[in-house]
Interface confidence: medium
């Protein structure tokens, strides 16, 4: 027998630094955890103990603070060549800054391979990108050599910006003749890593012939076996293990998100390449496991040029810019209709002749909004007024509702109004008129929604049964502020771009803005 | 082969404005920051400020922030800097130079271009 | 902003000598072990070279007559068997914080 010891990370989006318990800024740091400098300590010390060794990432290492903000992905590649990464899988925020803002700092920088079965190359891009990405990588791993297979959400040309010149093919019929390749090669233990959420996870186990482990992403996805150390609550067992068509147990592993727990899989394979054995658990990258020095020296020197940044002007603003607690959970505030448009605008994907958008609807908790900006500071914006504005460290996530889910939310919304409560919904592409003459639970009498499969872009009444998508706080797609609804009943959730970075980028594209009340939300007559 | 390469002398009237280039070779431009830095006849180096060509971050020295912007054009790979209100004592030779702060050298200078002379007078 | 000083402000020497240059920052620019002060030589009518980044690290081509060291705010750099072609100014320069500022220099002259 030979065993082999998988360490694996997915959906880091930019934690270099370590982070709070939930991920955001660290505050106390004796309480923190995460960040490559820990990450570093804890995979040199199973290096040290363990003779076969793979250090994998299931990609969206891009997006989602300051550091992707300013270095642009040149900080990936530097870090996870430090930290001696073995294979990477793209993921859909690797083409957030379109596919020259993946190869000039992440493809042509990285010292290890990156990989993606099912994403394929046309035009002039083909021979531009031959070579940075590939669909596989065989590793010698001591004496034996192991196959890593690639693959990406093929929704990623809704979820990011890789242009006209990359197809996503399905994934299962583009692993497949990859995997046949390898078996041709002589290669008989195949690792399928790969940015496709859970639910794809599981069926690749299951339908590709020949993957003996799959190591997934994009789902946040936490698995654990016995009691979890710290908040998050399993989805399931770890490793997961699914019945393969064939008859095999192939086990399915992610690691959350966050770079908050290292995966920790040890597999065992017979010397014909199947899977005797595998169990592990993620690790918790807590404060019990010191930062390495050099790396976080590293840290510190890098960080040098990211303080100045945050009080740079991005952009200005001639208005007021309401976001204070007095209106926007109380009615409609310009603040909301701004992070509401920025939103959308950053979610603009013209992938269908039919529609002008794949998406035209925002909601915004109220009580999401921490701060207004004061136009009469020579009308500057900087990324510090933003922090105070969205200080929370979150994502605006893209989610598909049925019509009801979404007439349930502005129910919600004003179920207890008057109470300055946080989830009095602030929003872009709905006309909603509320009565609050009605019992809760019936007070919304108008709720219309602009129209994606159209020209001309025009409001029509909601329709219950429709399937809609939606741009909304993480927090919301989570349940938060009571949204018990949004989480139990979304059909699909796909996480965004960090929300300070939506709205800066957002700004500095307008270069002057003048948000408006503009009759949004209303209040019908006598009730307000 | 890593090189900067300047834009030629420059002959400037008080009052004026001057924009010199920088055209870099050998490594990718958008993962290195570029500094600009001065030095007037027989004096020492100052540092006016830099750029990071892949996000176009910018940092200047307070000295010089309401006259001096940087730029940077990643098409091409070439930096710019632009002094405005031009006066006696800008009279200098303008350096660009790549700073190694994303490998080893820490935002030292590693590489520098070979000096543009602005001569302001009236 | 950082003051960075340097002392002497010239320093004539033979050519087989010591030279020991001093570079004083207002403040510490140290940290986590690593010291954020570089050194570069230039000569009249050339651009400043590179000669010693983060206070004792010989950057790649430097001849290794030159040495550098120091930790917080006192720094040195050292010219071991001093050549002719040593004649020149050296600069050191700070990156601990924006902005970043150099020294007025040493200038060094050969008999």
């Known amino acids: 027998a030979w065993e082999l010891t998988i360490l694996h990370t997915n959906d880091v989006h930019s934690r270099l630094e370590q982070t709070s318990e939930d991920s955001s800024k660290c505050v106390n740091a004796s309480r923190c955890m995460g960040g490559v400098a820990r990450l570093f300590t804890k995979v040199q010390q199973i290096r040290r103990a363990e003779p076969n060794v793979l250090l994998l990432d299931a990609g969206d290492q891009y997006q989602g603070t300051i550091w992707f903000t300013v270095y642009k992905g040149a900080e990936v590649a530097h870090f996870m060549n430090a930290l001696r990464y073995d294979a990477m899988a793209l993921g859909n925020h690797e083409f957030d800054n379109g596919v020259e803002g993946l190869i000039e700092p992440l493809l042509k920088e990285a010292k290890f391979p990156i990989l993606s079965a099912n994403i394929k190359a046309k035009g002039p891009l083909a021979s531009q990108i031959s070579g940075l990405y590939l669909p596989y990588k065989v590793l010698p791993v001591g004496d034996e050599v192991v196959g890593i297979v690639g693959y990406t959400s093929k929704e990623t040309p809704f979820l990011s910006n890789p242009g006209t010149n990359l197809v996503f093919e399905d994934e299962i019929t583009a692993l497949q003749p990859e995997v046949d390749k390898l078996k041709t090669l002589n290669v008989n233990k195949i690792i399928a890593l790969g940015h496709s959420g859970f639910e794809m996870d599981k069926l690749i186990a299951q339908k590709v012939r020949g993957v003996d482990v799959v190591v997934g992403g994009h789902s946040n996805t936490f698995l654990y076996t016995g009691n979890p150390p710290s908040k998050e609550v399993p989805a399931g067992k770890y490793p997961f293990i699914v019945t393969s068509d064939d008859g095999r147990k192939v086990p399915v592993v992610q690691a959350y998100a966050f770079g908050k727990y290292l995966g920790y899989l040890k597999i065992e394979f017979d010397e014909r390449g199947n899977v005797i054995s595998s169990h592990g658990n993620p690790i918790l990258l807590n404060s019990s496991i010191p930062e390495d020095p050099s790396i976080k020296a590293d840290i510190n020197k890098w960080r040098i040029k990211l303080d100045n940044y945050s009080t740079q002007e991005l952009g200005k603003t001639i208005v007021y810019l309401d976001g204070s607690s007095q209106s926007c959970r109380f009615r409609e505030c310009n603040m909301g209709n701004l992070i509401c448009d920025a939103m959308i605008n950053n979610n603009l994907r013209h992938t269908d002749e039919m529609f002008w958008n794949h998406v035209s609807m925002c909601i915004l908790n109220g009580g999401g909004i921490r701060s207004p900006i004061d136009e009469r500071n020579n009308g500057t914006i900087t990324w510090e007024n933003l922090a105070a504005v969205l200080p929370f460290g979150g994502t605006f996530d893209l989610v598909q509702l049925k019509g009801s889910t979404l007439k349930k939310a502005f129910e919600h919304s004003v179920h207890r109004y008057g109470q300055s409560t946080g989830e009095f919904l602030q929003v872009g592409g709905i006309h909603v008129v509320y009565d609050l003459s009605r019992k809760p639970g019936d007070r919304v009498v108008k709720l219309d929604v602009l129209c994606t499969k159209c020209r001309v872009p025009s409001y029509d009444p909601l329709k219950m049964d429709e399937v809609y998508k939606v741009i909304l706080p993480n927090f919301l797609a989570n349940g938060g502020d009571g949204f018990q609804m949004i989480k139990d009943e979304l059909l699909r959730h796909d996480s965004g771009d960090q929300d300070i970075n939506v709205v800066s980028t957002y700004i500095s594209k307008m270069k002057v803005i003048y948000p408006a009340v503009e009759g949004r939300i209303k209040f019908s007559t006598g009730s307000h | 082969e890593v090189q900067l390469v300047q834009s030629g002398a420059e002959v400037k009237k008080p009052g004026a404005t001057v924009k010199i280039s920088c055209k870099v070779s050998?490594?990718?431009?958008?993962?290195?920051?570029i500094t600009w830095v001065r030095q007037a006849p027989g004096q020492g180096l100052e540092w006016m400020g830099d750029?990071?060509?892949?996000?176009?971050?910018?940092n200047y020295n307070e000295k010089f922030k309401t006259r001096v912007t940087i730029t940077a054009d990643k098409s091409t790979s070439t930096a710019y800097m632009e002094l405005s209100s031009l006066r006696s004592e800008d009279t200098a030779v303008y350096y660009c130079?790549?700073?190694?702060?994303?490998?080893?050298?820490?935002?030292?200078?590693?590489?520098w271009g070979q000096g543009t002379l602005v001569t302001v007078s009236s | 902003e950082i003051v960075l000083t340097q002392s002497p402000a010239t320093l004539s020497l033979s050519p087989g000598e010591r030279a020991t240059l001093s570079c004083r920052a207002s403040?510490?620019?140290?940290?986590?072990?690593?010291?954020?002060m570089h050194w570069y030589q230039q000569k009249p009518g050339q651009a400043p070279r590179l000669l010693i980044y983060?206070?004792?690290n010989l950057e790649s081509g430097i001849p290794p007559r030159f040495s550098g060291s120091g930790y917080g705010t006192d720094f040195t750099l050292t010219i071991n068997n001093i050549e002719s072609e040593d004649a020149a100014y050296y600069f050191c320069?700070?990156?601990?914080?924006?902005?970043?500022?150099f020294g007025q220099g040493t200038k060094v002259e050969i008999k």
């Open positions: 130079a790549k700073e190694g702060g994303l490998t080893t050298e820490d935002y030292a200078l590693d590489y």
């Open positions: 050998g490594y990718t431009f958008t993962s290195y920051w």
């Open positions: 750029i990071y060509p892949g996000s176009g971050n910018t």
């Open positions: 403040k510490n620019v140290s940290t986590s072990g690593y010291s954020y």
């Open positions: 983060l206070a004792s």
């Open positions: 320069q700070h990156s601990r914080e924006l902005p970043f500022t």
